[in-house]
Structure formats: C-alpha cells, structure tokens
C-alpha cells in the first residue's frame, strides 16, 4: 500500500485506520521509514496531502499517528505525500514519495431496500417458479473486503406460495395460486448482511404481489331454473324476462354470452346485455295459449373471450331451465269460418232455413256465445238469426229478382264477458226460381207495305226473361190460336229469336189499319211459363219498292190525322 | 322423503261446497307449480287445476272454471280446492300432485280423498 | 284441447312378455311434452317416463318411452306381476290432458 515512483529508499508498511475505531487518541497507524535513517535524529519527516495535520501527524521518528476518529463510509482512504529532509540543511534525503492510508471497513451500516414500496403483479395461476419481481437491498459497508456487505435474502412472510432466491434477491411462485381464493399477498423479504453470520444487521421490505385474473372460470347460471310468463297478446321482440349467470373472473374475462341450447318450438330467443351481462328472452314467435300454453327452453351461457390455453377450464357449459308459462288474454269469440256463403230459393215462405253459424269462446270451451245480426240503419230486415244457435232464417219471401245477393254481418258475443264482440261476414245468394214469364225484349214498331207479297219478313222479334239467365234457356215463339193466322206467320228460329212473316198479300189500309198480333212466348224453365205478347202491325202505302222508310213516314202522318178527328 | 297427503272429501248435496287440502312434507313447497287431479269412479284421470309455485297464477279445466277455486298456504305447506256449485258429475277421487320441478309431468300424487255429489 | 287416445284398450299378457302401449294425440304434442303413469288398484297414479323417452327417479329399465309428434308408445320389455296395472299417457304441451287408458291384464 504505497506508492513509490523514483526511490527504493523507503520503507514501507501497509497503512490503515480501522473506522469508528474508539480507542485512545491520537491512535498510531504506522510507520514511515528512510533506509537512509541511522535514527540519530538527524532526519525530519514531513507529512502533506489529505488530512495532514488535522486527521495525521507524524513524529521524529516517522510514526504516523491519526488524532479523530474515521468513517470509511464518508472517506475511504487517504492520499498523502511523505518527505524526509536533513533536519540542518533541510535538503530531502529521498524524493518525494505519495503514499495511501486506507480506511478499514467494520459492519457498521444495515442493509437498506431504497426503492420500496414495492408491488407486482403476476397473472393467478402461474406455474411453479414463475418470477414475480425482484428486489434489492444496498449496505454502506465495503463491499469489496469481508462479508459487511454481502447480503443474503430470505422469506420472512409469504410462504409456502412464494420463496426468494438468497442471492439476487428474486421473488418466485412456489405453488399455482387463484385469484378467486386470495388475489392480494404481502410478502416480507430480508436482507442480512455478514452472510448471515453473527452480528450481522438486517433489513426487511414488504412487497405486495396482486394477482391479475386469467380467464379460469367459466360462468355458471345463479339458478338451475327461471320461470317466465309472457302474456299471449305480447308481440314479437318483447322481452319477457331476463336470466344471470355469475362468473368469478372480472373484466373481460367475466364477460359472457347467452344463447338458446334447446327450444324445439323455435319461439323464443336469448340476447346478452353486456352492460348488465344478463340473458333477456325475447319471444320470436307469436304464443297462443289456446294452442300451447308452457315452453320449456334450455339456454347457455360461455365467455366472450377464452384464450386457446384455458379452454380446458371452460369444456362444458353451463346451462339452465326456463319454464315459460303463457298467460291468457280473453279473447273474442272466433267464428268457424271467417265468411259464410249461404244460399235460398227466391220465394220460399218467411222463417224459411238459410244456413247456420258457429262460434266458440276459445278461452272456454264451456261458456256459451250469443248471436245476433248488425242492422243496417236503412236496410229492410229479411233475415234474422236464433242467437243461442246462430240458424239463420228469412222473415220473408225473397226475390231474386230485386237482389239476388244479400251481405249481412253477424256477431257473436261472449256471455261472460259481453265486452268480447267478434264479427263475421255472411253472403246469402238468392237462388233463382222460374216465376217470371218471357216477354218481349222491346217495343216493337212493325209495318207491312199494302204492296207486301206472300213470305216477306216483316219484323224479327226476340224475347227476355227477369229470371237468371242460364246457358241453356230457351225462349220457343209461335202464334196464338185462331187470330189473323191467315195474314202473318210466326218462324221460330231456334235461338230464342223468331221471324214475323207474312202469309198473303193485298193488305189494304182502307181495310184494316193495324193488325194485332198476339204472340205466344214459352220458356223452358221448371215449370215452363209462357206469355202473349202483342205485336201491333201498321199497314202502310208504300212506293213501289215496298220502302218501309217512307211507310213510316206516312203512318205517322196518318196516325196524326186519325188523332185529331 | 316427499309426502301429499289429502283430506276434507265426503258426501255432499248437489249446488253446495266443500274444501279440500292437500298437506304437503318433505321438499320446499314454495319451489313447485302444484296440482288437483280427479277421476271419476271406474273412469280416467282428469287435470282440474294448477297454481304456481308462488301462488300469483292459476288455470283450470273448462269443466270447472268458474266454479272452483285453487289456493295455497305456503306458511302452512298446504294446498286447497274449493270446490262451489258442485255436481254429480263432479263425483270423483281429488288427487293433489307435485309438477317436476324441470318438467310439467307430476312426480308425486297423493293418496286421494273422495267427493260424492249426491242428492 | 288436446285429445290422447291410447290402444289397445285391455291388453293380455304373461309375466316375462314385452308390452307395446300406443298413444296417439289429436294434434302435435309439442316438444315430446308426453307422459306415461301407471295406477294399480286402489292407488294414485305413478309417473314412470317424461318427456316422451324419460325414465322418472327409481323407474327400471324394462320400462322405455319412445315417439314424437302425434304417436307415442311405452314399451315395457318383459312383463313383471306387480307391472299388471292401468297405464295412462298426459300431454303437457297444452294444459294437461290423459288418455283414456289401457289396462294390462294377466293372460
């Protein structure tokens, strides 16, 4: 421990100040020596540099003494410049020489953790040996001479879940831990300085370790089964209650889904609030209590997010029961038939059977309706109805001929429950009978030219029936008996029209100015039912081509004539 | 184990009433949708009524809505009939029964108590 | 409602035979909501199978339920004497409604 640039002329020993050291001062440290020293005192030592004087002195005979106590922690070693002269001529004996005075270290400081408080996080169930953190301890002493300042780590709270390795001072699982269980530790580490030995000092820190959550538990309903009820009435998309399941993870890794496992009827439908992280059933079909009235659905819940390496926490669902019960709504009777096509023959006698109509209280089968006919305010009543069992009869004879559809609306009314009116539509057609006789389609101007041969048609005629008309109707003309036969002929033509003819010639105006023709009519309905119709023939004076125009023309000058007389 | 155990049957003239009650033992009343069921001597077994496990809803058979009334003491684990305007068709064995709690079949019937209409 | 008709009406039978029980609903029985109960003399009914397939608690397994839809049967694979009773379905599809019953006798 000395520093000797040019001369071996002095001579040394190691130098040192063991620190805090209270013995007696001043305290010797040790010697400086010249071999050129005969220890006549005839040489000076001079000491300078670092604490010359004021901490060192040196005597005569170049002992070197310290006055005060040291702490190496504050100076750990001193440089200082020795010089011995000639006490007479103060001329050096030997060069200048720089020299160390080191401080020797003793325990005197504990350990230290500086960066605390400490905290980690580690995800729960981190396999055996994980590391949590690490934490380190500083100590004052010299670390590089003895044990003052090694250090040893050990557990004093924490076990058996986490140890610390004695050296680095690093934290480490020792076993897998969940989080639902315990998700906060406080472990108390110590540093002991001296390896440990005796009289060693030591420090502790407190490290609080949280578990983070992984994705290690599945959701799992809070009840094994929920009963809903949803009123018949409700439409779709109403939400009819909602279902929970619980889920000890948080966060995301508590976030779920809800779905439908079983619901062979396909009515119903479960969405996730993810706010609240309830399942809402929703109806997705309309429920009729009259044709179903309880569901059962079995409905699952999993997690949103599973990563690929915990899905061996999460291979069954769990899964629920929902009971849904339908409530009735009272409803409406319901008639068998939305509409009623009835029909009668026109004519029948008033209380005559049209048809009946039917409903039932779907609610109860047992409750009794009662019917009745809407009444138009300026409709003829031509109907009525037996309101117990809904027969339907004439009040009287219809005519078919007057209408032959007839569109009335009847009601059928809850006993129980009055308020409970439904309506039907009822179409009465009016069957047609054969009660009107065919007769001419219209008047008929018919003239005959005084000039007028034998077999000269003089009108075609055709006939009309008020009854329906029907593909086959037929209408037969021919001549009354017995009157003016010998003048005109009827041609029945045998597609219900016919030809006026005539029989002979030379009419004569003077003679005869009209002739009236009765014309018989039958049809071929059941019972047949025949007509005489009248065709009036005017005989006129014609030009010689027998021109009915100018006929006419004449008649009806003739005619005006004849009125006025 | 599960019980039912029914009483308050007996002869009775028709257009009066009677009360009948069901005692149940040995599960929570209060979790199960509970029923009557009759049958007439030498014939089938017909459902007459349900109420629900807490009580707020109940339906019936057509042939005696109106007429009967289905009710429950969950203080008392006890379910009752009453049974008004009553008739000779209404002649029977009353069974209470248990709904499976996962299910609408019935799990567990009583023994049954017998009502006789008759003038 | 719905109505259940069951067949046959008696059925004859010795111990150690297999029992074929049918049950045919009026209209669709919803969800296999069907159910098979046995009543012997002078007792409440028993449920031995729900939800058409189901074995009820304690029921053995000579008893088997099977069908869906309109038609549903019971089978019970051999015949033991205390299994000589009146069997009944139920649907619960609809409010609750039981066959008329067939009744097995011993041959």
């Known amino acids: 421990d000395y520093k000797d640039d040019d001369d071996k002329g002095w001579v040394w020993e190691p130098l040192f100040v063991t620190e805090e050291e209270t013995s007696t001062m001043p305290m010797y440290v040790g010697q400086l020596k010249s071999d050129l020293d005969k220890e006549d005192g005839s040489l000076q030592y001079i000491l300078t540099g670092e604490g010359a004087d004021s901490i060192f002195f040196i005597n005569e005979h170049g002992k070197i003494y310290v006055r005060q106590k040291l702490d190496r922690e504050k100076k750990s070693f001193y440089i200082l410049r020795a010089q011995v002269i000639n006490r007479k001529t103060r001329h050096p004996i030997e060069p200048d020489s720089e020299f160390i005075i080191k401080v020797r270290d003793i325990n005197d400081h504990e350990p230290q953790f500086l960066d605390g408080p400490y905290v980690a996080t580690v995800p729960e169930m981190s396999p055996e040996g994980t590391s949590v953190t690490q934490v380190t301890a500083t100590d004052g002493d010299d670390p590089s001479y003895g044990n003052n300042a090694r250090l040893l780590y050990s557990l004093i709270q924490g076990q058996p879940y986490f140890s610390v390795e004695p050296k680095t001072g690093v934290i480490r699982m020792t076993s897998q831990m969940d989080r639902e269980t315990k998700d906060q530790y406080l472990v108390v580490i110590q540093a002991k300085d001296m390896v440990g030995q005796a009289g060693a000092f030591s420090a502790t820190a407190t490290v609080t370790i949280n578990l983070s959550d992984v994705n290690d538990n599945k959701p799992i309903f809070k009840e094994s089964l929920y009963r809903l009820t949803v009123s018949e009435s409700a439409p779709t998309g109403t939400s009819i209650g909602t279902i929970m399941a619980y889920d000890n993870d948080i966060g995301e890794n508590a976030e779920m889904d809800y779905s439908i496992e079983e619901d062979d009827s396909q009515t119903f439908d479960i969405i996730t609030n993810h706010e609240t992280q309830e399942g809402i059933v929703i109806l997705k079909k309309k429920v009729d209590f009259e044709h179903q009235n309880h569901y059962g659905i079995r409905a699952k819940v999993k997690n949103h997010h599973v990563p690929e390496q915990l899905m061996k926490y999460h291979t069954e669902a769990s899964t629920t029961f929902i009971k849904i019960q339908v409530e009735d709504v009272d409803e409406p009777p319901v008639f068998t038939l939305e509409s009623y096509v009835m029909e009668i023959a026109e004519g029948v006698v008033s209380g005559s059977l049209v048809g009946t109509v039917s409903a039932r209280d779907l609610d109860n089968d047992d409750s009794s309706v009662r019917y009745s006919i809407v009444q138009g305010l300026h409709l003829k009543r031509l109907f009525s109805i037996n309101e117990h069992n809904g027969t339907i009869i004439t009040t009287e004879p219809l005519d078919r001929e007057k209408a032959s559809w007839h569109n009335i609306t009847v009601t059928a009314t809850e006993t129980r429950n009055p308020e409970k009116i439904s309506e039907a539509n009822v179409y009465i057609q009016v069957l047609d009978v054969n009660d009107h006789a065919p007769e001419f389609s219209k008047y008929y101007e018919t003239f005959v030219c005084e000039n007028a041969v034998p077999g000269q048609l003089i009108q075609n005629i055709s006939a009309v029936d008020k009854d329906d008309s029907a593909e086959n109707h037929r209408f037969y003309f021919s001549l009354a008996q017995a009157t003016n036969s010998s003048h005109f002929t009827v041609k029945d033509n045998q597609d219900n029209t016919a030809g006026i003819f005539t029989a002979g010639s030379g009419f004569s105006r003077k003679e005869q100015f009209y002739f009236f023709l009765p014309i018989l009519i039958l049809d071929n309905g059941s019972p047949p039912l025949t007509s005489t119709n009248t065709l009036t023939v005017t005989v006129c004076d014609c030009d010689t081509e027998v021109n009915t125009l100018y006929c006419r023309y004449g008649a009806f000058l003739y005619s005006i004539g004849l009125s006025t007389e | 184990q599960v019980q039912l155990v029914e009483s308050g049957g007996g002869v009775v003239q028709p257009g009066r009433s009677l009360r009948l009650s069901c005692a149940a033992s040995?599960?929570?009343?209060?979790?199960?949708?509970m029923h009557w069921v009759r049958q007439a001597p030498g014939k089938g077994l017909e459902w007459v009524a349900v109420?629900?496990?807490?009580?707020?809803?109940?339906y019936y058979a057509d042939s005696v809505k109106g007429r009967f009334t289905i009710s429950r003491d969950t203080s008392k684990n006890t379910l009752y009939l009453q049974m008004n305007s009553l008739r000779a068709e209404d002649t029977a064995v009353y069974y209470c029964?248990?709904?499976?709690?996962?299910?609408?079949?019935?799990?567990?019937w009583g023994q049954g108590t017998l009502v006789s209409v008759s003038s | 409602e719905i109505v259940l008709t069951q067949s046959p009406g008696t059925l004859s039978l010795s111990p150690g035979e297999r029992a074929t029980l049918s049950c045919r609903a009026s209209?669709?029985?919803?969800?296999?909501?069907l159910a098979w109960y046995h009543q012997r003399p002078g007792q409440a009914p028993r449920l031995l199978i729900y939800g058409a397939s189901s074995r009820a608690t304690g029921i053995p397994d000579r008893f088997s339920g099977s069908g869906s839809g309109t038609d549903f049967a019971l089978t019970i694979s051999s015949l033991e004497p205390e299994d000589f009773a009146v069997y009944y379905c139920q649907q619960y599809s609809n409010s609750w409604t039981f066959g008329q019953g067939t009744k097995v006798e011993i041959k």
């Open positions: 040995g599960f929570t009343f209060s979790s199960y949708d």
């Open positions: 109420i629900s496990y807490d009580g707020t809803n109940e």
């Open positions: 029964a248990r709904e499976r709690y996962f299910d609408w079949s019935f799990d567990y």
């Open positions: 209209q669709s029985v919803s969800n296999t909501y």
